[in-house]
C-alpha cells in the first residue's frame, strides 16, 4: 500500500498528519521498496546482474542520470536546480517505468505499483517546486516510439534493459532523496 | 559471499599522499554505493567519503573536502580513496563499506588498512 | 551535522542478562537508524538496520526499537560472543554520523 494509503493511518487520529517533504520521503523510500523486490525477480530470473556486456543494451537507452551541474550532489548543490532535474528525471523515467509493465511474473503487482508511485511523487515534487517553467516534459511521440524500439528487441536485450532500468532507476531515486533531506 | 579487501595503508609525513584502494567480489559492484569508514586508534568510527554506483555523484565529511578523492573502477570492482596534504588527525584503520541496496547503512565491511601520518 | 549520543559508555553485565542501548539523535532521523558489533581488532558488523529490521544471519536476542530521536538496541540474553562495543549510526542524511560507542563487558 503506497504511503499515505495505509487505513491505519485513518484509524489514529492522534498522529500529526505528514509534512509535504515528509510524504515525499515516505514515497521513494516506497518506490525503493519496490525496485528491490523487482531486483530479485529479475536477478533469480536471469544472470544479468552477474553480465559484463551492459554497454551492448546501454547504447539503446538514453536513462536520466544525476550529474553534477544539476546541483543534486554535495558539491555545487543548488536546491531549484536540482528539483527541477529531479522532476525532469522522473518524467523521462516514466517511458521505461511503463516498459517494466509485463516484464515481471510474480512481481506484476509490484511494477505497477512503482509505475503508479511514481506518477504521486512527481506531483508532491511539481506542488513544491517554484520554477515550473523549468521543467520540460518528454514529447509523447518519442516515447512511444521509443517504447516500440524497445519492445522489439531481444529476448537477452530486453532482459538487459529491464535489469538496466531498475539500477538506473534507483541511482536516480537515491540520489534524489539525499538531495531533498539536504532541503 | 562478499568480500572487501583494503590495500595502501603505511606510514606517510604530514602533508604527504596515499593513494588506498579495495578490491570487491561476492557481488554485482556497480548496484551500490561505496564508502570509506575510519576509525582512529580507541576512537569513534568516522564516515569519510561515499561514492554513488556509477561513480557520477560523491560525498565527504567537511574536514576531508578538497583533500581526499573518491573514485571507483566498475571495470575492475573496485573502490579507492586518494588522500592528499595528510595531516596528523588522519591516523585512522580505513575500512572500505558497501552501503545497503537502497539505504544508506553500512551492511559489509573490509578488514581495514591503517595510515600513520607522523614525520 | 546530526549529533548521535549514545549512554551508557560503558556497561558490565553477565551472561544471560538482558541488557538495553540507548541512542538519541540531536534531530529527527524517521527510522533511518543502524546498529553494529564491533571486537577489537576487527571491522564492525551490521546488526539491525531500519531502527528494527535485523539483518540476515544476526541471532534474534538482538532486537532495535524507536523511531524519530529515540532509539534502543536491546539484547535479550547476554551470550559470551556478544561482549563487544555496539555503535549506532544514522543513515538518515549526509555527513553518516555513528555514536561513540557502548563497550559491553563482562561482570
Known amino acids: 500500500v503506497p504511503p499515505g494509503e495505509d487505513s491505519k493511518d485513518v484509524a489514529a487520529p492522534h498522529r500529526q498528519p505528514l509534512t509535504s517533504s515528509e510524504r515525499i520521503d515516505k514515497q521513494i523510500r516506497y518506490i525503493l521498496d519496490g525496485i528491490s523486490a523487482l531486483r530479485k525477480e529479475t536477478c533469480n530470473k536471469s544472470n544479468m546482474c552477474e553480465s559484463s556486456k551492459e554497454a551492448l543494451a546501454e547504447n539503446n537507452l538514453n536513462l536520466p542520470k544525476m550529474a553534477e551541474k544539476d546541483g543534486c550532489f554535495q558539491s555545487g548543490f543548488n536546491e531549484e536546480t536540482c528539483l527541477v532535474k529531479i522532476i525532469t528525471g522522473l518524467l523521462e523515467f516514466e517511458v521505461y517505468l511503463e516498459y517494466l509493465q509485463n516484464r515481471f511474473e510474480s512481481s506484476e503487482e509490484q511494477a505497477r505499483a512503482v509505475q503508479m508511485s511514481t506518477k504521486v511523487l512527481i506531483q508532491f515534487l511539481q506542488k513544491k517546486a517554484k520554477n515550473l517553467d523549468a521543467i520540460t516534459t518528454p514529447d509523447p511521440t518519442t516515447n512511444a516510439s521509443l517504447l516500440t524500439k524497445l519492445q522489439a528487441q531481444n529476448q537477452w536485450l530486453q532482459d538487459m534493459t529491464t535489469h538496466l532500468i531498475l539500477r538506473s532507476f534507483k541511482e536516480f531515486l537515491q540520489s534524489s532523496l539525499r538531495a531533498l533531506r539536504q532541503m | 559471499e562478499v568480500q572487501l579487501v583494503e590495500s595502501g595503508g603505511g606510514l606517510v609525513q604530514p602533508g604527504g599522499s596515499l593513494r588506498l584502494s579495495c578490491a570487491a567480489s561476492g557481488f554485482t559492484f556497480n548496484d551500490y554505493d561505496m564508502a570509506w569508514v575510519r576509525q582512529a586508534p580507541g576512537k569513534c568510527l568516522e564516515w569519510v567519503a561515499s561514492i554513488t554506483p556509477s561513480g557520477g555523484g560523491t560525498y565527504y565529511r567537511d574536514s576531508v573536502k578538497g583533500r581526499f578523492t573518491i573514485s571507483r573502477d566498475n571495470a575492475k570492482n573496485s573502490l579507492y580513496l586518494q588522500m592528499n596534504s595528510l595531516r596528523a588527525e588522519d591516523t585512522a584503520v580505513y575500512y572500505c563499506a558497501r552501503h545497503g541496496y537502497t539505504l544508506d547503512y553500512f551492511e559489509y565491511w573490509g578488514q581495514g588498512t591503517m595510515v600513520t601520518v607522523s614525520s | 551535522d546530526i549529533q548521535m549520543t549514545q549512554s551508557p559508555s560503558s556497561l558490565s553485565a553477565s551472561v544471560g542478562d538482558r541488557v538495553t542501548i540507548t541512542c538519541l539523535a540531536s534531530?529527527?532521523?524517521?527510522?533511518?537508524l543502524a546498529w553494529y558489533q564491533q571486537k577489537p581488532g576487527k571491522a564492525p558488523k551490521l546488526l539491525i538496520y531500519?531502527?528494527?529490521r535485523l539483518q540476515d544471519g544476526v541471532p534474534s536476542r538482538f532486537s532495535g526499537s524507536g523511531s524519530g530521536t529515540d532509539f534502543t538496541l536491546t539484547i535479550s540474553s547476554l551470550q559470551p560472543e556478544d561482549f563487544a562495543t555496539y555503535y549506532c549510526?544514522?543513515?538518515?542524511?549526509?555527513?553518516?554520523?555513528f555514536g561513540c560507542g557502548t563497550k559491553l563487558e563482562i561482570k
Open positions: 549510526q544514522q543513515s538518515y542524511k549526509y555527513p553518516w554520523t
Open positions: 531500519d531502527a528494527t
Open positions: 534531530e529527527g532521523i524517521s527510522n533511518d
